[in-house]
Structure formats: C-alpha cells, structure tokens
Interface confidence: medium
C-alpha cells in the first residue's frame, strides 16, 4: 500500500493576511486565524512529518479584500510559489480582471500548473494562453506518479469576465476524456481538483470513471467528521464517500473558504491505484499555529502599499451620500441607490442576444450601509470612505429565486416598520410601493422588476413564479437580517466580488457621481 | 527562461562611484527580490542589499548604508546598484540575483561585473 | 546582526557522503538556501526552503534543518561536486540576507 496526503485550500479569495473568525479584518491578533503565514507553518509540518505530500488549491484565490484590489493577483502568484502549491484549479473569480488579468500576473508566473480541462481557448486567446493552463498534470509524488485532472465551474460566464474566446464546457463531459489520457498514460491514482460546487463534485464522483479522489471548491462547503473546531456547521463528514456508478467508493472533500481551514485527507492506494481507505479533517489554522516569521515579515512587506491605496482618490460626488441609518433603514437613501447601481453594473454579461443582461435586480439590507459620504469634503470618495460604508467584508453575490420569495422578502422588508431595523431593504431594477397602514406580512401593494429579455428594459408586475436572477449581500443569502426565506428557498447561490471592490469600481468608472432619490421605493395612502 | 545580463566591467579611481546594471529578462520583474552580492578575491558572498521593484524601496546591510544606492526600473526590467566613495577593498565581483522573496533563495544570478579600484 | 558558521573545508573521498554543517542561534526557525561556487563562476542554488532542490541539481544533494543546525548532504561524492558550498537566510528581524563564510569541499 501507498499512502499519500492531500492539503487542500479552496476560495481563499484574498485572504493573505490572518482574520478574525468570521474572516472578516483581524482586530485581535491573539484569536485570529488562517493567513498565508499560518497556513505555511502547518504545511511545512506536514512535510516535514509525512513522505507524499502534496498542496492543492481548488480555486477563487482572486477577489475578496484591498490585496487583490492593488496587486490584481501578482500577490496570489507571488504567496503561492512561496508556499510552493503543487497544482491549482481555475475557479470563476479568477477571471474577474479578463482573461489579461488572469494570464499576466498569474498564468505567467506561478511556478505550478494550473488546470482546467473544461475551459477550451478559441480564436486569437488559443495561441495566445497556450500551455499556460492545462487540463491535466502527472506530478511525481516520491516513487509514484499522480494525475491531476482540473475542472471549473460553467457558470462562469455569467459570474465573471472570462471574455468571448474561452468556451466552459461541461464538467463531467470535459473530464472523462482527460482522465482515460492518464489511465493510457499509466496513471492509476488520479484526483480532479475543481471549482464548480460541492453538488457537482459528488457528480463527478459519481460520473467520472477513474477518479479516484474529488477535490472541491465554490461552495464554501465545510465538512468535518466528529465535534467541529469552531463555527461552521459541516454539511456532511470529511470526506464524504460517494458509491460511483462503477461501485467504486470514492473521496469528496472541500474545505470551507478564507483560508480558515487547511484541508487534510490521508488516502491509501493499493499497489493497482485502487483506494483502500481514506480518513482526515479540516484543520483549523487558529493561533495556537504559529505564523511563519518569514512570510509574514514578507506580508508585512506587501502591506505598505495597501495602507497608502487606501487614501488615494477613486472618483467624486457632486452629492451627498445619504448613507444614515435615518434614511436607509426608513426609506429610499441615495448611498442604497448607489450600491444597487454599483451591484448591477457589476454583473453586466452579455451572453445571449435575447437578453440585454442577465440580471437587472438587486436589494440589499439598509442596515448594511453603515456611514454616509459628505460631499463637501472636495467631492474626493477613498476606499478608506467606502470601508466606513461597507466595514463587513462581505460579497454582493448572484442568487436565483422564485418571484413568491422575493414577495416574502418585501414583505419581511416593513414587517416591523419605524423601529429603525436592518432589513428594510435598498433596491435596483425594483420599484416597491408599501401600505403601512395593512398589516404586517400584506403591506407589499406593488412590486414591479426590471425586464431582463428585452431590448429596452422596462418595469413588469413581479409573476410569483417566475424565476429571477437578483444581486444581493451574501449576508442576505445566507438569511441574515431575518431573511430565512432566501436562504430556504433559493434555488441557486454564487458567490461575487467584493462589496468595497464593486463599488470603488463603479466609482472609478465613473468618475463623478450623482446618485438620486428617484422613487424605487414608495408608501401608499398617504402615510408617507 | 529568466536571465540576469549585467553591464562590464569596471576599473575605478578611488573616492569615485560605480554604477553597474541588471537587465533581467524572460519573466517578470516587478514582484521579485532582486539582491545585490559581491565577492572580494578569494573571500565568501556579501549581501549588499536588495529591492522588491513592486514596492521602490531598497534595503540595504548596514556596512554599505549610505554608500550604496540599489534602485529598479520596471519599464526596462533593470536593476541598479550604485557604490560610492570607492576603495580599494571595495574590489570585486558583484553579482545580482533574484528570488521570488528574500527567504527563498535566489534561484537565478546575473554573470557577474568585475569592480577593479585602483590608483 | 545574525551569524551563520561554516566550516572551511571538508573532505571526502568520491563516492562517499560528504556533510557541509551550518551553524546558528535557533536555525531552524529560519528558511535555508545552500549554494554551489565553482571558480571563475556565479553560485548556483543547489537547496532552497531547507529541504528543496531546484529543477536540474542532482537527487544527490539534500538538506536538513533542525535546532541549531542545518546540513547540506551530498550522497555519491563525485569529483565534479568540488567547489565552494553557502548557505544562506533571511533575518527577518534585520531584512537582511545572510550568507555564511562558505565551506570549501574537496574531494581527495
């Protein structure tokens, strides 16, 4: 028998430096977690201690605090080689700056492959991206070799900016033909390592003959076998066993996101490549792991730039922001306006001639807008404002929902109405009229959505079921606020970019802003 | 392949300066450790100090602060280190290098710029 | 500052192990490099992150960091092996870079 030992990360998103427990800013060092520094001193460990290790990440290393915002993924090349991954899949995020912005600073530079087998170059980018990733890797692990078969999520399209030459094929169709290459190749132990959601990795568990180990990511999904080391509610055992359709049993892990946990899975191969047993845990990188002073005196280093990023200027409004929990927790507030434009101008995809967008729809929890922005400061807006506006480091993620949930949410929205509460929610792509005067859970009159397959987009009454597509917080998605029906009912969950990042975009693109009180949200019979 | 192409060799007078260059190609520049190393005739390696061209700033061993000045243009990829107020135990060949940081060793070395100081 | 200790020479005959020590305060908290220098040549890396050997050097290099101490092991001495051998750290305390005075290796 054979063992080898899988570390895997997944959905790091930019979380270089340590955090605290729910991955937000470190406040207090002494109960902070993960971090590249962290992480580096349990992996050198583990070499240390075991023969056959290897590093594996599952994707969306980009996207999520100031460090990908300044160095545009040149930090993830730069802490990853360092760390020295063996391999890495493509996830969506990856591609958030275009496929430049992947090829550049990353493709160009990591000194590991980076795979996906279900991405296919065309045109002009084929040449162009060429062996820079590729579907496969047979890496030497001691005396044995191993296949690594890569895989991304093919949604991608609508959640990021991967362009028109890359075409993302389907997983499972995309993946089998590259595996039986590494069985002709003599490889008889191969792992897929992906970024498409916990559901498409058991799939592929399922579906793929000849995988014998998955490797996931996008989900964010925590599994653990036994009592879990701190908040996150595991969503299975680690690994979780899928029975494939040859009767194989075979490996599904994944290991949460942020950087928070370093996935640990012992596998035993007999000497065909068959798995005997496989067994491990998430282990969570808290402060009892000490940071490598290396790395971090390198992080440290890094850190400068970011610090004077945050005072430079992005753009300029000639209003103001209206961001006062006065305002955006009561009624319409123009900072509320501005995000939800800022939301949905982010998630701009023209993918289908039919559809002048994907998406046309955001809400988003008043209580969330934390600092208006006065104006008379020069009309100069910083990242260092909007982090006063937005301080929870959260996502404005993509969700499918079903038109009687969003009637739910509204309704949700004043059901306690006057008492200055968070969930009265800012909206895009929405016109709402309320009757206070009804009770809770009937005061939604009218509720009107911005049409998606149209060529001139126009307001139609909302149809119960019908299903849309709407931006929102994750912190909405995963029912915060009280918004239990989105997180029970939706239908479909991807995660976006970062809040701040979205919004200083949209700023900078701008240049000038003028955001209105424009009438998204409206009181009937006179009460308001 | 990276490649680390530095300028001839010099013969200076004493109390003058020397400025010598590394133009690296191949890879990119901006967010690797560019270190600079001489060595005197039969002596060991001596750091002499280095740059992240991504951040501008140089650090420098104290025994060279205030007479050796490292710099880096990223539109050209190119490394400078400049060495004042010349002596002659400052003869030697100075080499540059780069890693991806300090601690990770420095995986490609430029050939090498004999300094001679002579009167 | 901080201080790496090389011995100056080693010897050994070909095809036996030959073992360069380094020496320093609490080396094992630190990230080791080891260089070979041959006359009239740049140094080129044979270890990296105490243990790794860049692409292209031979398995018959290796290394080892623990306590004090870290060790550059060349198994199966061949002639070819002889040169000046370096090791390196980062002080993170200093930022400095740190070479020790080098460990001539000769082969008998």
């Known amino acids: 028998a054979w063992e080898l030992t899988i570390l895997h990360t997944n959905d790091v998103h930019s979380r270089l430096e340590q955090t605290s427990e729910d991955s937000s800013k470190c406040v207090n060092a002494s109960r902070c977690m993960g971090g590249v520094a962290r992480l580096f001193t349990k992996v050198q460990q583990i070499r240390r201690a075991e023969p056959n290790v290897l590093l594996l990440d599952a994707g969306d290393q980009y996207q999520g605090t100031i460090w990908f915002t300044v160095y545009k993924g040149a930090e993830v090349a730069h802490f990853m080689n360092a760390l020295r991954y063996d391999a890495m899949a493509l996830g969506n995020h990856e591609f958030d700056n275009g496929v430049e912005g992947l090829i550049e600073p990353l493709l160009k530079e990591a000194k590991f492959p980076i795979l996906s087998a279900n991405i296919k170059a065309k045109g002009p980018l084929a040449s162009q991206i060429s062996g820079l990733y590729l579907p496969y890797k047979v890496l030497p692990v001691g005396d044995e070799v191993v296949g690594i078969v890569g895989y991304t999520s093919k949604e991608t399209p609508f959640l990021s900016n991967p362009g028109t030459n890359l075409v993302f094929e389907d997983e499972i169709t995309a993946l089998q033909p590259e595996v039986d290459k590494l069985k002709t190749l003599n490889v008889n132990k191969i792992i897929a390592l992906g970024h498409s959601g916990f559901e498409m990795d058991k799939l592929i568990a399922q579906k793929v003959r000849g995988v014998d180990v998955v490797v996931g990511g996008h989900s964010n999904t925590f599994l653990y076998t036994g009592n879990p080391p701190s908040k996150e509610v595991p969503a299975g055992k680690y690994p979780f066993i899928v029975t494939s359709d040859d009767g194989r049993k075979v490996p599904v892990v994944q290991a949460y996101a942020f950087g928070k946990y370093l996935g640990y899975l012992k596998i035993e191969f007999d000497e065909r490549g068959n798995v005997i047993s496989s067994h491990g845990n998430p282990i969570l990188l808290n402060s009892s792991i000490p940071e490598d002073p290396s790395i971090k005196a390198d992080i440290n280093k890094w850190r400068i730039k970011l610090d004077n990023y945050s005072t430079q200027e992005l753009g300029k409004t000639i209003v103001y922001l209206d961001g006062s929990s006065q305002s955006c927790r009561f009624r319409e507030c123009n900072m509320g306006n501005l995000i939800c434009d800022a939301m949905i101008n982010n998630n701009l995809r023209h993918t289908d001639e039919m559809f002048w967008n994907h998406v046309s729809m955001c809400i988003l929890n008043g209580g969330g807008i934390r600092s208006p922005i006065d104006e008379r400061n020069n009309g100069t807006i910083t990242w260092e404002n909007l982090a006063a506006v937005l301080p929870f480091g959260g996502t404005f993620d993509l969700v499918q929902l079903k038109g009687s949930t969003l009637k739910k949410a509204f309704e949700h929205s004043v059901h306690r109405y006057g008492q200055s509460t968070g969930e009265f929610l800012q909206v895009g792509g929405i016109h709402v009229v309320y009757d206070l005067s009804r009770k809770p859970g009937d005061r939604v009159v009218k509720l009107d959505v911005l049409c998606t397959k149209c060529r001139v987009p126009s307001y139609d009454p909302l149809k119960m079921d019908e299903v849309y597509k709407v931006i929102l917080p994750n912190f909405l998605a995963n029912g915060g606020d009280g918004f239990q029906m989105i997180k029970d009912e939706l239908l479909r969950h991807d995660s976006g970019d970062q809040d701040i990042n979205v919004v200083s975009t949209y700023i900078s693109k701008m240049k000038v802003i003028y955001p209105a009180v424009e009438g998204r949200i409206k009181f009937s019979t006179g009460s308001h | 392949q990276v490649q680390l192409v530095q300028s001839g060799a010099e013969v200076k007078r004493p109390g003058s300066s020397v400025k010598v260059s590394c133009k690296a190609s191949?890879?990119?520049?901006?967010?690797?450790?560019i270190s600079w190393v001489r060595q005197a005739p039969g002596q060991g390696l001596e750091w002499m100090g280095g740059?992240?061209?991504?951040?501008?700033?140089?650090n420098y061993a104290q025994k060279f602060q205030g007479r050796v000045t490292i710099t880096a243009d990223e539109s050209t990829s190119t490394a400078y280190m400049e060495l004042s107020s010349l002596r002659s135990e400052d003869t030697a060949v100075y080499y540059c290098?780069?890693?991806?940081?300090?601690?990770?060793?420095?995986?490609?070395w430029g050939q090498g710029t004999t300094v001679t100081v002579s009167s | 500052s901080y201080v790496l200790t090389q011995p100056p020479s080693v010897s050994v005959t070909p095809g036996k192990t030959a073992r360069i020590a380094c020496g320093g305060n609490?080396?094992?908290?630190?990230?080791v490099s080891w260089y070979q220098q041959k006359p009239g040549q740049a140094p080129v890396l044979v270890i990296f992150?105490?243990?790794d050997r860049p692409s292209g050097i031979s398995e018959r290099f290796s290394g080892s960091n623990s306590g004090n101490t870290a060790t550059l092991t060349i198994s199966r001495v061949e002639a070819g092996d002889e040169a000046d051998y370096y090791c390196?750290?980062?002080?993170?305390?200093?930022?400095?870079?740190?070479f020790g005075g080098g460990t001539k290796l000769t082969v008998l």
């Open positions: 390196q750290v980062w002080d993170s305390n200093s930022d400095h870079v740190i």
């Open positions: 992150y105490d243990t």
């Open positions: 609490n080396l094992e908290s630190k990230i």
């Open positions: 740059i992240i061209p991504i951040f501008g700033t140089a």
């Open positions: 290098a780069r890693g991806v940081s300090y601690y990770y060793g420095m995986h490609v």
């Open positions: 191949g890879g990119t520049f901006s967010s690797y450790a």
